[in-house]
Interface confidence: medium
């Protein structure tokens, strides 16, 4: 903590000017008014202050404000909020999103730091729910920040949001929030035409149920292999090899080099070598002609 | 073009006055604070006096304070360098610099002042 | 007052040369240090500010590094009308010092 010395005759300020770069640490303490400072917050972010400086100008602000920061300060702090705690933080109330995108544009290009994690998460709390204007902002700044939520918090994201996501949005997210995002995607797109459905379905396939890619199936997607290897293994096993070629297209080709990957492993060892001898693709580890298969899943529902 | 002109340099006697202009173009100049750095004649640079943009603050180096003045005025971009009791070791080019951000940029081409009896 | 001391104070170089000028400050300055190079009878000219950030429209071959209180800046490949004099400057608080320069002559 600065200690309290007298300003020096002279050195009072008048205002935040570019000139105070040049106060040392002490003369800022006794000579900037926290009043003036707040009411002129604006000002700060276009002056270049040293750490050592705006550690002084954030020790005025938190006397001023003990309870936290009002969002009409939090909204000009700049690279002052580089140096805020997540403790901070917690004691903001920001609910406008132009105050939102002023501070991320301070971290942009970094990875998310605890600070703007916390702020993002007051952020969300105080809305009730992740709008898509939100949404649309973060994952602007964040391409990875939908992934980074819990199957709980991405519960709260509405369908129309949806709109909102790009498929780079989801390339880290895992089975469990693919299925929560999924059915979201699924309402959400519901009214376009089967193309531009696919198109659109894509990113989200990593939590569609069996019965949904049955349905693609039937209307010629001519899925990626990428996209095919991120399905849900035990939504792949139940399909057939007529429905996973329809499914494919001319992509089915590339089986070949996944066999031994999961889902296509897995799903290898469920169709009848039979049936993967029609593909021409030299698929092997499928069930030998003459074996009967049990469905042990039916029988154990059954019993 | 940023562009910065000093003028009224010249001849003066030990103990003399002279007020130095510098004339700015190309930029708003209310918005950046305005210094006088200088050279004697074969030396280094000094800097000389700092004035911020609303003229709240003002700073001056050791070896002129008390007898050197800075000013400003913005209606007319122009600065000011109002040098009293001036002495042989005030001899140099003074140059008219804007402050951006820490850095001294750009320079204007200075003008000289010579203290000589 | 935070004294700032250049060496050497000239050096001898021919063209494509690689070139070293060092500054040191008397306590530390952080980052905050810029370099400018200044031809006879002319203006200085911003090179470098905060220590290694190259102004806009300054050849590559210009370079600067360090924090604290040692810095150099460097010119990998030195050409004609890069012989001129170079200053460091601290901008970390007033009053605002300079190096006291390194002339760069034709070897």
């Known amino acids: 903590e600065v200690e309290k010395t007298a300003c020096p005759s002279g050195k009072k300020a008048r205002e935040i000017d570019e000139s105070l770069i040049f106060y040392k640490k002490w003369e800022l303490e006794a000579c900037v008014d926290a009043a003036l400072l707040a009411t002129q917050m604006d000002r700060v972010n276009a002056i270049p202050f040293t750490y050592e400086q705006l550690d002084v100008l954030k020790h005025k602000l938190d006397e001023l404000y003990p309870q936290g920061y009002p969002e009409s300060v939090i909204q000009h702090l700049g690279y002052l909020f580089l140096k805020m705690s997540p403790e901070d933080i917690r004691k903001w109330n920001v609910t406008s999103l132009e105050t939102l995108k002023a501070l991320l544009e301070v971290n942009k290009g970094h990875e998310m730091s605890p600070q703007v994690a916390t702020l993002i998460d007051r952020f969300v709390k105080g809305r009730g729910q992740l709008d898509k204007d939100t949404l649309d902002t973060l994952t602007a700044f964040y391409p990875g920040y939908l992934c980074s939520l819990s199957p709980e918090e991405l519960s709260s994201v509405p369908p129309s949001s949806i709109w909102a996501v790009r498929p780079q949005d989801l390339d880290t997210c895992d089975p469990r929030q693919l299925d929560v995002l999924y059915p979201k995607a699924r309402l959400a797109f519901q009214n376009m035409n089967g193309s531009e459905y696919f198109v659109k379905i894509q990113s989200f396939l990593g939590g569609a149920p069996t019965e949904d890619l049955k349905a693609l199936s039937q209307q010629n997607v001519s899925m990626d292999l990428a996209t095919f290897m991120k399905l849900r293994t035990d939504a792949v096993l139940p399909l057939t090899v007529a429905e996973v070629q329809k499914l494919l297209g001319p992509h089915v080709e590339g089986l070949k080099a996944e066999e031994r990957h999961r889902p296509v492993r897995d799903w290898i060892l469920r169709q009848r070598q039979d049936d993967l001898d029609t593909l021409g693709l030299g698929l092997q580890g499928g069930i030998p002609n003459g074996y009967l298969v049990l469905d042990l899943s039916m029988q154990e529902a059954l019993s | 073009e940023v562009q910065l002109v000093e003028s009224g340099g010249g001849l003066v006697k030990p103990g003399g006055s002279l007020r130095l202009s510098c004339a700015a173009s190309g930029f708003t100049f209310s918005s950046y604070s305005m210094n006088w750095v200088r050279q004697a004649p074969g030396k280094g640079l000094e800097w000389v006096s700092s004035?911020?943009?609303?003229?709240?603050?003002?700073y001056y180096a050791d070896s002129v304070k008390g007898r050197f003045t800075i000013s400003r005025d913005n209606a007319k971009n122009s600065l000011y360098l109002q040098m009293n009791s001036l002495r042989a070791e005030d001899t140099a080019v003074y140059y008219c610099?804007?402050?951006?951000?820490?850095?001294?940029?750009?320079w204007g081409q200075g003008t000289l002042v010579t203290v000589s009896s | 007052d935070i004294q700032m001391t250049q060496s050497p104070s000239s050096l001898s170089a021919s063209v494509g040369d690689r070139v070293t000028i060092t500054c040191r400050a008397s306590q530390s300055i952080s980052s905050y240090l810029n370099w400018y190079q200044q031809k006879p009878g002319k203006a200085p000219k911003l090179l470098i500010y905060?220590?290694?950030s190259l102004q806009s429209g300054v050849p590559s071959r210009f370079s600067g590094s360090g924090s604290g209180t040692d810095f150099t800046l460097t010119i990998s490949s030195l050409q004609p009308e890069d012989f001129a004099t170079y200053y460091c400057?601290?901008?970390?608080?007033?009053?605002?010092?300079f190096g006291g320069g390194t002339k760069v002559e034709i070897k």
């Open positions: 905060a220590a290694s």
């Open positions: 610099a804007r402050l951006r951000g820490r850095v001294f940029d750009p």
């Open positions: 004035i911020s943009s609303s003229s709240s603050y003002i």
């Open positions: 400057q601290q901008s970390y608080s007033t009053p605002l010092t």
